[in-house]
């Protein structure tokens, strides 16, 4: 996922809508002007803000990387939602890229969890039922995995 925090404009473009801050803050989909007197709308598809705020810039929309699919586009109040392509996943501790799911479990292990956009297949020992934490199986059985469907927002 590639994302810059701030949209590049310093001043509002003429077509951007303005309104007055409410209690000193601006609503989602807007940022505050430099003098604090106006709320300026974010640009649809370019930048956004999700909360009441006093941001001087709206936040730049995420662009989904290759290897990701866009589940929902960026709006003025919500960032793009990206998801790993079928057969790949993104772990919480390494969110920068989608990794290929394993195609099967090592010998002596059985698959108990499918490949999803946020987790690899899950393998456990047939007898003990303990999880296998190894990255790559030494010998794979021909057990194929099916991708999960739920989405996770990218931020």
């Amino acid at each position: 996922i590639t994302q810059q925090d701030l949209a590049p404009q310093q001043r509002a473009a003429p077509q951007q809508k303005r309104s007055s801050p409410s209690e000193g803050l601006c609503p989602p989909g807007h940022h505050i002007s430099e003098d604090g007197r106006d709320c300026i709308s974010c640009k649809y598809g370019q930048d956004y803000s999700t909360h009441w705020n006093d941001l001087l810039f709206c936040l730049r929309c995420t662009r989904c990387d290759s290897g990701e699919v866009e589940l929902s586009p960026c709006t003025t109040t919500r960032n793009t939602v990206c998801q790993c392509e079928e057969g790949t996943f993104r772990e919480e501790d390494s969110p920068e890229m989608c990794r290929k799911c394993r195609t099967g479990c090592p010998r002596g292990m059985v698959k108990v969890g499918d490949c999803t956009p946020w987790s690899d297949i899950e393998c456990v020992h047939k007898e003990s039922g303990t999880k296998h934490s190894g990255e790559v199986p030494a010998v794979e059985e021909t057990v194929t995995s099916s991708p999960g469907t739920p989405a996770s927002p990218c931020s």
Epitope: Q4, D5, L6, P8, Q10, S22, E23, G24, L25, I32, E34, D35, G36, R37, W52, D54, L55, L56, F57, L59
Partner: antibody, heavy 119, light 106 residues
């Protein structure tokens, strides 16, 4: 003279709760956006929460979202920070701060109150 | 989050010296930068906002400059009361601070 005086800090166990208060004087409290900022021992400053002048709108960084709640009582000229599910990393001096006129940043700060999260 | 990298982390100087502290933003923040002075056990005090505007009552020996990603706080002639820790802050996207520069007596 603008004055902000924090209170309510102390020692609390991990998982515990604490409510900080900030008494404001010397300015029209109800006209100003207010924030809490913290400073962990020997570390830099970190923004914790912001509330609109009337108290209707709030926002937080991800580090405290869902655990901390900022509120205010304009009749009493007081700002509050309710802190729940406290963690060791929340140990810090907590400052209440006022956002200035037409500058969109903090112009006056209180002296701070120390919160220690430890078992 | 925008990271503000302040340097040096500490410096030793004498009364009358010219002192320069720099702050680098991880991305363009325009001129939305403030500088604060903090003494031990005291509240931070606003010196400069919008990168170069002195706050009410701040002596003219304090000046700020910069835009985009590079910012500077200069104390033209250090006074005894200026020995303190100085912080930069960006306020274009939420609020993030530099790690501070401690100005000590040489």
């Amino acid at each position: 003279e603008v004055m902000l005086v924090e209170s309510g800090g102390g020692l609390v166990q991990p998982g515990g709760s604490l409510r900080l208060s900030c008494a404001a004087s010397g300015f029209t409290f109800s006209s100003y956006v207010m924030s809490w900022v913290r400073q962990a021992p020997g570390k830099g400053l970190e923004w914790v929460a912001t509330i609109s002048s009337g108290g209707s709108y709030t926002y937080y960084p991800d580090s405290v979202k869902g655990r901390f709640t900022i509120s205010r009582d304009n009749a009493k000229n007081t700002l509050y920070l309710q802190m729940n599910s406290l963690r060791a990393e929340d140990t810090a001096v907590y400052y209440c701060a006022r956002r200035g006129d037409s500058m969109i940043t903090t112009d006056y700060w209180g002296q701070g109150t120390l919160v220690t999260v430890s078992s | 989050d925008i990271v503000m990298t302040q340097s040096p982390s500490s410096l030793s100087a004498s009364v009358g010296d010219r002192v320069t502290i720099t702050c680098k933003a991880s991305q363009d923040v325009g001129t939305a930068v403030a500088w604060y002075q903090q003494k031990p056990g005291k509240a931070p005090k606003l010196l400069i906002y919008w990168a170069s505007t002195r706050h009410t009552g701040v002596p003219s020996r304090f000046s700020g400059s910069g835009s985009g990603t590079d910012f500077t706080l200069t104390i033209s002639s250090l006074q005894p009361e200026d020995f303190a820790t100085y912080y930069c802050q960006q306020y274009s996207s939420y609020r993030t601070f530099g790690q501070g520069t401690k100005v000590e007596i040489k």
